[in-house]
C-alpha cells in the first residue's frame, strides 16, 4: 500500500508500550448493511454436507458468543437423500481475531487473540492412499 | 471459569468515552497451536463446490490482508467431474471483527468493524419456486 503521512489528530503515542498497546473504539461499525439479509442462515440444512451449530460462550472474550459448525456426517448426502461414504463432509475453518479481557474480568482492557472456528462444511473427494 | 472480583489491576476507566474506548494489546495470542497446519487449505480444489481465493488488501485495516472465497461455478461438480446445475454452489459467509484505523492513517488508534467474508463454498439443493 501507499504510505500516507501520519494524521496530526492521532492520539499521543508516547506510551511505553507503544505501538503494541492501542486505543480501540468498541462502537462497532457494520460494513454489511447492503448484504442479503438471509445470507447463509439456511445452508446448514440444505447442504450436501449439512452441519449443526453449537453455541460457544466465553464472557472473557469479545465477541462472547460464537456459533460453531460441526458436520453432521462423515460422508455427503447424495441425490437420494442418503449418506454417501465415498465422499467426505469436512469443516471449512477460518482463523479470526477476537479480543480477550486482559487482565481477566476487566471491562476496558483486552488483548488480541486468534482463534480457529469452523464456519460450515463442504463436500470433498477423499484423498485415497494406495498401498504399494 | 470462576468469577473473581473486578481485577484491581484493570486500567483506569474514567475516560469520558468509557466503556466504548478500550486498551488493546496487539501482541496476538494464537490459540491454534495444536491444530493441523494443513487444515482446509486444499479443500477449495477438492470440493464439489470448488472456490478460488482472492486477496483483499487494505492498509487502513488490521489485518490488512484477507483472503476471500469466490465459488467457481453456479452448479456443483458431479461424480463425472461435470457441473450439475440442478445443485448450487453457494458461499459460506461469516461476520468477522477487524480493526479500522480511526482517525485514518493513525498507527495507534482504531475502531472495531464488522465485515462479512466468504470463507469457502458448499453445495446446496436449490429452493424451487413453483408458479401457480
Amino acid at each position: 500500500g501507499i504510505t500516507i503521512p501520519r494524521n496530526p489528530g492521532c492520539p499521543n503515542s508516547e506510551d511505553k508500550n507503544f505501538p503494541r498497546t492501542v486505543m480501540v473504539n468498541l462502537n462497532i461499525h457494520n460494513r454489511n448493511t447492503n448484504t442479503n439479509p438471509k445470507r447463509s442462515s439456511d445452508y446448514y440444512n440444505r447442504s450436501t454436507s449439512p452441519w449443526n451449530l453449537h453455541r460457544n460462550e466465553d464472557p472473557e472474550r469479545y465477541p462472547s458468543v460464537i456459533w460453531e459448525a460441526k458436520c453432521r456426517h462423515l460422508g455427503c448426502i447424495n441425490a437420494d437423500g442418503n449418506v454417501d461414504y465415498h465422499m467426505n463432509s469436512v469443516p471449512i475453518q477460518q482463523e479470526i481475531l477476537v479480543l480477550r479481557r486482559e487482565p481477566p474480568h476487566c471491562p476496558n482492557s483486552f488483548r488480541l487473540e486468534k482463534i480457529l472456528v469452523s464456519v460450515g462444511c463442504t463436500c470433498v473427494t477423499p484423498i485415497v492412499h494406495h498401498v504399494a | 471459569g470462576i468469577t473473581i472480583p473486578r481485577n484491581p489491576g484493570c486500567p483506569n476507566s474514567e475516560d469520558k468515552n468509557f466503556p466504548r474506548t478500550v486498551m488493546v494489546n496487539l501482541n496476538i495470542h494464537n490459540r491454534n497451536t495444536n491444530t493441523n497446519p494443513k487444515r482446509s487449505s486444499d479443500y477449495y480444489n477438492r470440493s464439489t463446490s470448488p472456490w478460488n481465493l482472492h486477496r483483499n488488501e487494505d492498509p487502513e485495516r488490521y489485518p490488512s490482508v484477507i483472503w476471500e472465497a469466490k465459488c467457481r461455478h453456479l452448479g456443483c461438480i458431479n461424480a463425472d467431474g461435470n457441473v450439475d446445475y440442478h445443485m448450487n454452489s453457494v458461499p459460506i459467509q461469516q461476520e468477522i471483527l477487524v480493526l479500522r484505523r480511526e482517525p485514518p492513517h493513525c498507527p495507534n488508534s482504531f475502531r472495531l468493524e464488522k465485515i462479512l467474508v466468504s470463507v469457502g463454498c458448499t453445495c446446496v439443493t436449490p429452493i424451487v419456486h413453483h408458479v401457480a
Epitope: 462497532i28 457494520n30 439479509p37 445470507r39 442462515s41 439456511d42 446448514y44 440444512n45 451449530l53 453449537h54 453455541r55 460462550e57 466465553d58 464472557p59 472473557e60 469479545y62 465477541p63 462472547s64 458468543v65 460464537i66 456459533w67 474480568h105 471491562p107 | 471459569g1 470462576i2 468469577t3 472480583p5 473486578r6 461476520e95
Partner: antibody, heavy 121, light 107 residues
Framework: EVQLVQSGAEVKKPGSSVKVSCKAS????????IHWVRQAPGQGLEWMGV????????FYNQKFDGRVTLTADESTSTAYMELSSLRSEDTAVYYC??????????????WGQGTTVTVSS | DIQMTQSPSSLSASVGDRVTITCRAS??????IDWFQQKPGKAPKRLIY???DLASGVPSRFSGSGSGTDYTLTISSLQPEDFATYYC?????????FGQGTKLEIK
C-alpha cells in the same frame, strides 16, 4: 428505542401446539440472540433456549425434551417460539429477551412484555 | 444442571434498611451472575450484570459481589420502589439457570 413486542395471550387444549412471536425493533436484529424464558403462575423464571437469528443456530434446555422449536425471520426481525404437546403445567407467561453476542455483559438487557399461554381442556 | 439457591426466599424490611440477598451455586463452574428485579405483572428488569456491574439507569444503592459459588446482591438503603422479587441467574454452564427468587416485602 429498543423494543421487543410479543404476540397476544393464547388459550390452548392439551396436546396442541402454540407459537408465540417476538418482534424486535430499535437495534440490529442479527447482533443479538433471542433467549426465551417462562414463568408459571406464582413460580420462578425458567430458561427455555436460545436462537441466533444470524446463523440459525439454536440451543435448548433439555428439560423440554424436543417440544420447543425456536426460529427467527430476519426479514421482519421477528423471533418465534413454538411449544408442542402442550400440557397443563405449560400454563405460564412466556418472555423473549435479547442477548448480545458481542458482549455477555450485555445479556438479557431488554425483555418482551410477556405472552400468557393457558393450557386447559 | 447447576442449581442456584437463593436465600432468604422472602424478606420483610423497612424503607432505609440495608438488605442483602445471597445466591449459592451448586458448583463453582459458572462464569458470573446477573441479578434481576421483577414486579407483579411485569417482565424482569436487569439490575446487575457480570456479578459487579450496575445496569444502565439502575440506582447506585444496588451493588453486587461474590465469587466461586457464593454471590450477593445488596441494597444499601431500601426505597419504596424496591419492594419486588429478585432473581439471580448464572451464566457459563448450560442450561442457564435462575434462582427460585427472593420476595422483598414491606415490614
Amino acid at each position: 428505542e429498543v423494543q421487543l413486542v410479543q404476540s397476544g395471550a393464547e388459550v390452548k387444549k392439551p396436546g396442541s401446539s402454540v407459537k408465540v412471536s417476538c418482534k424486535a425493533s430499535g437495534y440490529t436484529f442479527t447482533d443479538y440472540e433471542i433467549h426465551w424464558v417462562r414463568q408459571a403462575p406464582g413460580q420462578g423464571l425458567e430458561w427455555m433456549g436460545v436462537n441466533d437469528p444470524e446463523s440459525g443456530g439454536t440451543f435448548y434446555n433439555q428439560k423440554f425434551d424436543g417440544r420447543v422449536t425456536l426460529t427467527a425471520d430476519e426479514s421482519t426481525s421477528t423471533a418465534y417460539m413454538e411449544l408442542s404437546s402442550l400440557r397443563s403445567e405449560d400454563t405460564a407467561v412466556y418472555y423473549c429477551t435479547r442477548y448480545s453476542k458481542w458482549d455477555s455483559f450485555d445479556g438479557m438487557d431488554y425483555w418482551g412484555q410477556g405472552t400468557t399461554v393457558t393450557v386447559s381442556s | 444442571d447447576i442449581q442456584m439457591t437463593q436465600s432468604p426466599s422472602s424478606l420483610s424490611a423497612s424503607v432505609g434498611d440495608r438488605v442483602t440477598i445471597t445466591c449459592r451455586a451448586s458448583s463453582g463452574i459458572i462464569s458470573y451472575i446477573d441479578w434481576f428485579q421483577q414486579k407483579p405483572g411485569k417482565a424482569p428488569k436487569r439490575l446487575i450484570y457480570a456479578t459487579f456491574d450496575l445496569a444502565s439507569g439502575v440506582p447506585s444503592r444496588f451493588s453486587g459481589s461474590g465469587s466461586g459459588t457464593d454471590y450477593t446482591l445488596t441494597i444499601s438503603s431500601l426505597q419504596p420502589e424496591d419492594f419486588a422479587t429478585y432473581y439471580c441467574r448464572q451464566v457459563g454452564s448450560y442450561p442457564e439457570t435462575f434462582g427460585q427468587g427472593t420476595k422483598l416485602e414491606i415490614k
